[in-house]
């Protein structure tokens, strides 16, 4: 069976954790009000029934209050992401109260024991919130619980147990093991707060999924399909992260949810947008780039409150690092004829030319197969803002890049030795920008020349009708 790797290592390592010999272990939860942007500052500890620290540490009753809830730990110390998140919240919401929920003694256990402790920690947070509600001007509607991994389910319990309804819970890659498929009262769920938004960055359909795969919020966002995060491959972490092991890859992908949230706080001028879609494959095909009927949303802190009747799964692509924003384009290519295609799918690339910049050469991912006499839809994305698109270069790669394709070509050749040249006919490409929701049709430069074959390219320019806008709203207009 697969070895369950956690955010900080292997579960099996925990079996040998030394016990706290000759020391009274208080299995308790502490609430640390982060009073300074200085990460070294010890902060103020709040406890139920003691009002003095609230006064001494200038707790602002009318401001937003964030509770940051960490997850399982193998080291017993706060992970480095926590200080980044605290700092980002202070930067974005200067008057807000930022409280770190320290449940390290209960999280520094076997994973299964830490899971069993989530309920009691949720109760502690609920008790703190119930006590704060007794104070004048404090409103549960201003409370935002932010839970990472196991901490997301702790937030769910807190929201469930508190008297009243918490304003918002953000689940940052909620833990999967022991929660996948669980009853809604035993995991984070939409009824735990007025608005529950979730980022899923480490879901796996094979082996053990560290992050939960199922949707658990009002909106569930799956960046890059919710699994393989750019910049987190073994090659990437070997060079840039503390140590390049499989554990570190897991940590990188699991923790990416935190960094996407931090990005949304500190780079609010570069918001990332996600688009509602039934599954990752359909999104990869470019089918789901609509903003009609609340089908798109900002991710992270800037997400617009959406309380859907059922869970809304949303997808987006991202860069490998901050700022994570990319620009999504749907490309509809109508293939009206082709000949001698053989067994192999063509490998297409596009280059987009815009008023601000030109894209790199972008591959068109063929999710299933190229259909003839049909419109084929693709998703492409760029890291830079190209501005208004002016022209498109479509290239059909000549030499086969894979041994598999070479073998298929060889087999094709054996069965059809005098196989004449393969050819596709394309008259126009329709492009829709996910970020602006604008649509544009591109026509071949030479109306007589619509054919493309391996090793050749075809140029498309904006057709005469220019930009066509349907009655669709741009996500940028709807920023909060």
């Amino acid at each position: 069976s697969p070895v369950p790797f956690g955010p900080e290592g292997r579960l099996e390592d925990k079996l040998h954790k030394p016990k706290a010999t000759q020391t009274e272990v208080k299995p308790s939860v502490r609430f640390n009000l982060r009073t300074s942007k200085d990460p070294e500052h010890e902060g103020c500890y709040l406890s139920v029934g003691h009002s003095q620290p609230l006064e001494d540490c200038s707790f602002n009753m009318t401001a937003k209050t964030f509770f940051i809830i960490h997850g399982w730990t193998m080291s017993g110390i706060f992970e480095n992401w926590l200080h980044k998140l605290v700092s980002a919240l202070h930067t974005r919401e200067k008057d807000a109260n930022v409280v770190v929920v320290d449940w390290l003694p209960l999280a520094h256990q076997l994973y299964t024991d830490a899971v069993n402790n989530t309920r009691v920690v949720g109760h502690s947070i609920a008790r703190m919130l119930d006590w704060l509600q007794e104070k004048d001007d404090f409103s549960l509607g201003n409370v935002h619980l932010i839970g990472y991994s196991l901490g997301a389910h702790v937030a769910g319990y807190a929201g469930n147990f508190v008297k009243g309804t918490v304003g918002r819970i953000t689940g940052l890659d909620p833990a999967g093991p022991m929660f996948e498929g669980a009853d809604i009262h035993k995991r984070l769920s939409p009824d735990d707060a007025d608005f529950v938004d979730v980022l899923h960055t480490y879901t796996r359909s094979f082996g053990l999924s560290i992050g939960i795969q199922m949707p658990v919020g009002h909106i569930d966002i799956y960046p890059n399909g919710g699994d393989f995060q750019p910049g987190c491959g073994l090659n990437d972490v070997l060079g840039s992260i503390a140590y390049g092991t499989i554990t570190e890859v897991v940590k990188c992908e699991h923790e990416r949810a935190v960094h996407l949230f931090v990005d949304s706080l500190v780079n609010q001028d570069k918001p990332s947008f996600a688009f509602q879609c039934t599954d990752s494959n359909r999104f990869k095909k470019g089918i789901c780039l609509s903003c009609r009927k609340n089908r798109c949303n900002s991710i992270g802190y800037n997400a617009k409150k959406m309380r859907n009747k059922r869970n809304s799964k949303m997808y987006l692509k991202t860069r490998a690092g901050m700022p994570f924003r990319v620009y999504h384009y749907q490309m509809k290519i109508h293939v009206f004829s082709y000949k001698n295609m053989g067994e192999i799918e063509p490998t297409f690339y596009v280059t987009l030319y815009g008023t601000n910049a030109d894209s790199q050469t972008l591959p068109l991912e063929i999710v299933e197969r190229i259909e003839q006499n049909a419109t084929n839809t693709f998703l492409v994305y760029t890291e830079e803002d190209l501005g208004d698109l002016l022209k498109i270069q479509l290239t059909w790669e000549g030499a086969s890049q894979s041994w598999y394709n070479l073998w298929k070509e060889f087999r094709s050749y054996l069965s059809q030795p005098r196989n004449p040249g393969r050819e596709l006919n394309i008259r126009r490409i329709r492009v829709k920008s996910g970020e602006t929701q604008r649509k544009l049709t591109f026509c071949t430069e030479d109306p007589e020349n619509t054919s493309i074959s391996p090793g050749r390219e075809l140029w498309f320019r904006k057709c005469r009708d220019g930009w066509r806008m349907k009655n669709e709203t741009s996500p940028t207009v709807e920023l909060p």
């Epitope: 480095n80 926590l82 390290l104 503390a242």
Partner: antibody, heavy 120, light 111 residues
Framework: QVQLVQSGSELKKPGASVKVSCKAS????????LNWVRQAPGQGLEWMGW????????TYAGDFKGRFVFSLDTSVSTAYLQISSLKAEDTAVYYC?????????????WGKGTTVTVSS | DIVLTQSPASLAVSPGQRATITCKAS??????????MHWYQQKPGQPPKLLIY???NLASGVPARFSGSGSGTDFTLTINPVEANDTANYYC?????????FGGGTKVEIK
């Protein structure tokens, strides 16, 4: 001012036990973790582990599991290091040092050290 | 564990000159824009004293003659100008992950 005051030097025979104390003052004891660092004669610094002063949970570095025990008495803001079955190679200066739970966790305040000599 | 390699092992400098000590980590000690690398001074018979934290920040009460730089795996402690009472052992330390580890130390002597 913030300080960590350690107990005096100890001379022990092999096989005996020793308990070194580290008393904190000038700050809230439970708001910082307490680390133990060993320095053998003429050698460098070696981290032995630390204790969470609020929860009482100790963490031991690989070479210090077994004969070494960290404990606390929070009522007097004191941390203890007990070494049992002493060996000649345990001869060293033992330092306590505090580190924050938050931020980059460097050791900002150190005790003066307790010299433990193990000799027959 | 992260291994820190300090060089040189010892260094003799004249007062008023510059002393440079380097510390190389076996893997990156950066997290985002922060470096979890710190420097300590230990004079004979005394405990270590924090000089520089997070690669380049001067600890409270430390003279500006001491400075730190670097990122990733390569870090430098510079004393400029060196004074007579800077005779000590200097250690680098990483805290990006537990166990925190120390470099082997550099002995600085004043000529």
């Amino acid at each position: 001012q913030v300080q960590l005051v350690q107990s005096g030097s100890e001379l022990k025979k092999p096989g005996a036990s020793v308990k070194v104390s580290c008393k904190a003052s000038g700050y809230t004891f439970t708001n910082y973790g307490l680390n133990w660092v060993r320095q053998a004669p003429g050698q460098g610094l070696e981290w032995m582990g630390w204790i969470n002063t609020y929860s009482g949970v100790p963490t031991y570095a690989g070479d210090f599991k077994g004969r070494f025990v960290f404990s606390l008495d929070t009522s007097v803001s004191t941390a203890y290091l007990q070494i049992s079955s002493l060996k000649a190679e345990d001869t060293a200066v033992y330092y306590c040092a505090r580190r924050g739970y938050y931020g980059r966790r460097f050791f900002d305040v150190w005790g003066k050290g307790t010299t433990v000599t193990v000799s027959s | 564990d992260i291994v820190l390699t300090q060089s040189p092992a010892s260094l003799a400098v004249s007062p008023g000159q510059r002393a440079t000590i380097t510390c190389k980590a076996s893997q990156s000690v950066d997290y985002d824009v922060d470096s979890y690398m710190h420097w300590y001074q230990q004079k004979p018979g005394q405990p270590p004293k924090l000089l520089i934290y997070a690669a380049s920040n001067l600890a409270s009460g430390v003279p500006a003659r001491f400075s730190g730089s670097g990122s990733g795996t390569d870090f430098t402690l510079t004393i400029n100008p060196v004074e007579a009472n800077d005779t000590a052992n200097y250690y680098c330390q990483q805290t990006i992950e537990d166990p925190p580890t120390f470099g082997g130390g550099t002995k600085v002597e004043i000529k």
